[in-house]
């Protein structure tokens, strides 16, 4: 070995100075008698080496690196050898920090593995090999006096937790526990925990189960769930309190917490939930009133709440067939009485014959909002209910009676916009209890079965805005019937458009006769079209070769027109505009030439 490096310290604080010396022995005869020693840190040459010849003939170079800013680097002592740099010796330098105090030390007792698991946060990176040791001792008191030491617990590399096995634990007795961190630059210790392993016990959660329905037990109420939980057997003797959390499976609702609950609920009814809704439920427990850790949340239980019977008002309306008055078409609409009025599975119309106690005859059972049935001759009234698996709504009586009430007057309708119509009236005297408003396409598309209807509960109303099933350019028939206590008034009807269409074509112009200064024109009017408002007038336009325009307005019944004051032998362009309240349309252009002065008139 020709050279040897020695350093003040191979491991230093990051950024600290480091001093190194390199000695080259005299007997390295192949070297230059006065060799120049060079220093290299990593790949970079380092200036500042002070070289001297010692009394024994050896050469020494000393260098001080003012700041070691590499966490790891090789320092080399070199000589120029020919054209290359010859490394005589090198040392590894390391720089970093002493270990910070480990913090957030916490432990929990696992009764299944019978061990105390402690974990901590090691603090910032030291850049140096740092070992952690979990140290502990048994103590009779509050850890002021140290009892038997417990074997050190050394975590696997890179882990920040360690398990103290049962054989080193004393339950119901305090232990002093801390973490020691050590590296080449120093040692640090976490604050000491003083704990009884049982006070940090973490239990397993109970298992949630649904209640097996028993014949004698009442079914859960709407919006309620019946459940129970099976405690974790190894923790059965530990007093605990538990809490339940639940949320609907659909939607973005957050968990709702219920507690504290006893560990031993043989049966538990959770209420105040949405009816007919699937819920996810979980439970967790903690040793209580003694200290402990919350268990994890249990595996989820998924349950559906029972539904509630429909809570709706059923608005009804009926019509008799003209050819067969005993055949009745009944219509209804469910009006929710509460925010959650229950799902409706279907509807039943039934009749109870008088004198037959308890006998109810169903007339129809449907999921639709109407049904047609034959009304028994002695029946004056039927009952309508909405139902689901939880029961029925309150029955709505429907009384079939003659129209004996007064009629409303001055029924009129007007367009509000292309998709709504306002229907107004003057209420009769006395005030009715309400009105039924029906509307549907007028002739020729009229159909009783395709009518939309609404109940207006306010008998003092003087109008109603129709917003459903209204389209522009369609003629609608609107029927309004006043409703009284046990009867109704005669129905009145009116026709209206929500928006009318401009004429689609103007009539084609034809030349009937022409002269030198006049021309007689005629046309065949377009037949009236449904959805198009009637013509209000025509305007005829004519333009000469000099682009001068003339026009005349004609009434809607006109079938022809004579243009006077034309120039002989002149070219004219003529067109007709048909106009209604909804707009106007032009005909195609007719081009004609008046006769020359010497020509004879054409008829």
């Amino acid at each position: 070995e020709c050279g040897h490096i020695s350093v003040s310290a191979p491991i230093v604080h990051l950024g600290d100075p480091i001093t190194a010396s390199c000695i080259i022995k005299q007997n390295c005869s192949h070297l230059d008698p006065e060799p120049q020693i060079l220093w290299r840190l990593g790949a970079e040459l380092q200036p500042g080496g002070r070289q001297q010849r010692l009394s024994d003939g050896t050469q020494e170079s000393i260098i001080t690196l003012p700041h070691l800013n590499h966490t790891q680097a090789f320092l080399s002592c070199c000589l120029n050898w020919g054209n290359s740099l010859q490394i005589l010796d090198q040392v590894e330098l390391r720089a970093g920090y002493p270990p910070a105090i480990p913090h957030n030390l916490s432990c929990l007792m696992n009764l299944t593995t019978s061990s105390l698991i402690c974990q901590w946060e090691p603090g910032p990176e030291t850049h140096l090999p740092t070992s952690f040791t979990l140290k502990s001792f048994k103590s009779r008191g509050n850890c002021q006096t140290q009892g038997d030491s417990i074997l050190d617990c050394v975590p696997k590399d890179g882990q920040s937790h360690c398990c103290i096995p049962r054989k080193h634990l004393l339950l119901y007795q305090n232990m002093g526990i801390w973490v020691q961190a050590e590296n080449a630059l120093g040692t640090s210790m976490s604050p000491q925990l003083c704990l009884d392993p049982m006070d940090v016990v973490k239990l397993e959660p109970p298992m949630l189960r649904t209640m097996d329905p028993s014949p004698e037990a009442a079914p859960p109420q709407a919006g309620c769930l019946q459940l129970c939980w099976e405690p974790w057997q190894p923790g059965l003797h530990i007093n605990q309190k538990c809490e339940l959390r639940h949320k609907p499976q659909r939607g973005e609702a957050s968990w709702a917490l219920v507690g504290p609950l006893p560990l031993e609920a043989l049966q538990y009814e959770l209420c105040g939930l949405l009816p007919a809704t699937a819920y996810t439920l979980q439970i967790r427990c903690i040793r209580w009133p003694l200290p402990g850790h919350w268990s994890d949340w249990s595996p989820s239980l998924e349950l559906r709440t029972t539904e509630r019977a429909p809570t709706v008002r059923l608005d009804t309306w009926w019509r008799q067939r003209q050819l067969d008055p005993r055949t009745v078409q009944l219509f209804w609409k469910p009006v929710p009485l509460e925010e959650d009025s229950g799902r409706i599975q279907g509807y039943v119309v039934s009749w109870r014959p008088s004198g037959q106690a308890g006998a109810i005859l169903p007339l129809c059972n449907t999921t639709e909002l109407s049904c047609t049935f034959h009304l028994p001759s002695e029946a004056q009234e039927v009952a309508l209910v909405a139902y689901n698996s939880a029961g029925t709504s309150r029955p709505t009586p429907v009384v079939f009676s003659e129209s004996r009430g007064p009629a409303l007057t001055r029924l009129h309708a007007m367009a509000r916009d292309p998709h709504s119509l306002w229907v107004g009236w003057e209420p009769p005297n006395p005030w009715p209890q309400g009105y039924v408003i029906e509307w549907g396409l007028g002739p020729p598309s009229a159909s009783n079965s395709n009518k939309t209807w609404r109940m207006e509960q306010n008998g003092r109303a003087t109008g109603f805005l129709l917003k459903e099933n209204i389209r522009p350019f369609q003629l609608y028939e609107i029927i309004v019937t006043p409703l009284y206590q046990d009867t109704m008034g005669p129905s009145q009807h009116v026709y209206a458009y929500s928006q009318e269409m401009a004429p689609s074509h103007a009539p084609e112009l034809h030349l009937k006769h022409i002269g030198k200064t006049w021309a007689q024109l005629e046309w065949v009017p377009e037949p009236p079209e449904l959805g198009k408002s009637p013509l209000t007038h025509y305007t005829i336009f004519w333009t000469n070769a000099q682009n001068q325009s003339f026009s005349a307005i004609l009434n809607a019944s006109s079938r022809g027109f004579v243009l006077h004051g034309l120039e002989p032998a002149s070219l004219y362009h003529i067109h007709l505009m048909a106009a209604s309240q909804a707009g106007a349309t032009n005909s195609t252009v007719l081009t004609l030439m008046t006769l020359t002065p010497e020509g004879s008139e054409l008829h």
Epitope: R166, L236, H237, N239
Partner: antibody, heavy 118, light 107 residues
Framework: EVQLLESGGGLVQPGGSLRLSCAAS????????MGWVRQAPGKGLEWVSS????????PYADSVKGRFTISRDNSKNTLYLQMNSLRAEDTAVYYC???????????WGQGTLVTVSS | DIQMTQSPSSLSASVGDRVTITCRAS??????LNWYQQKPGKAPKLLIY???NLQNGVPSRFSGSGSGTDFTLTISSLQPEDFATYYC?????????FGGGTKVEIK
Amino acid sequence: EVQLLESGGGLVQPGGSLRLSCAASGFTFSLYWMGWVRQAPGKGLEWVSSISSSGGVTPYADSVKGRFTISRDNSKNTLYLQMNSLRAEDTAVYYCAKLGELGQSSAWGQGTLVTVSS
Amino acid sequence: DIQMTQSPSSLSASVGDRVTITCRASQGISSYLNWYQQKPGKAPKLLIYYASNLQNGVPSRFSGSGSGTDFTLTISSLQPEDFATYYCQQSIQYPQMFGGGTKVEIK
């Protein structure tokens, strides 16, 4: 100091009934599970029944299920064992025990002898 | 049900002897194993709970070990007052079964 004192034992005919009591003192009775263990003459220990701190959970040994009922009155710090339809094989010393958090019987009464014989 | 098998059923030993009694569970019981001592005409007394925890007031010559299915009670130096019957018991689940007992007699 924990003390458990059993009473109610005695001679009873087969098919008869007895009610054992266990008066507890020296600890917060309402926080602990309690239990009954019996020992037939010259035999080993046999667990009979336990009851949770609130009385909601009551497991039984198969040999007594349906005949014996365990109960407690936390206001009186007393544990009970109602024994019906007694059989000769129920003859034993009945011990009342205080249970620890890990199920161990940490304290025992002195026992009361039940003899079922005609 | 978890069955508990104790061995030996009886043993003879002298004062100062080291005595070992074993208890085997028919299935894993973690550390939920308790040891009791009973002297004739007396109530049982808890010695060890949760496999290795010494009950308050019990001399340190008694120790327990094991986990899962195999457990041991050791008396490091038998004393005259230790001659009695010893029972193991599992407490991980109901029914809480006891072992058949081991009678320690004077040689």
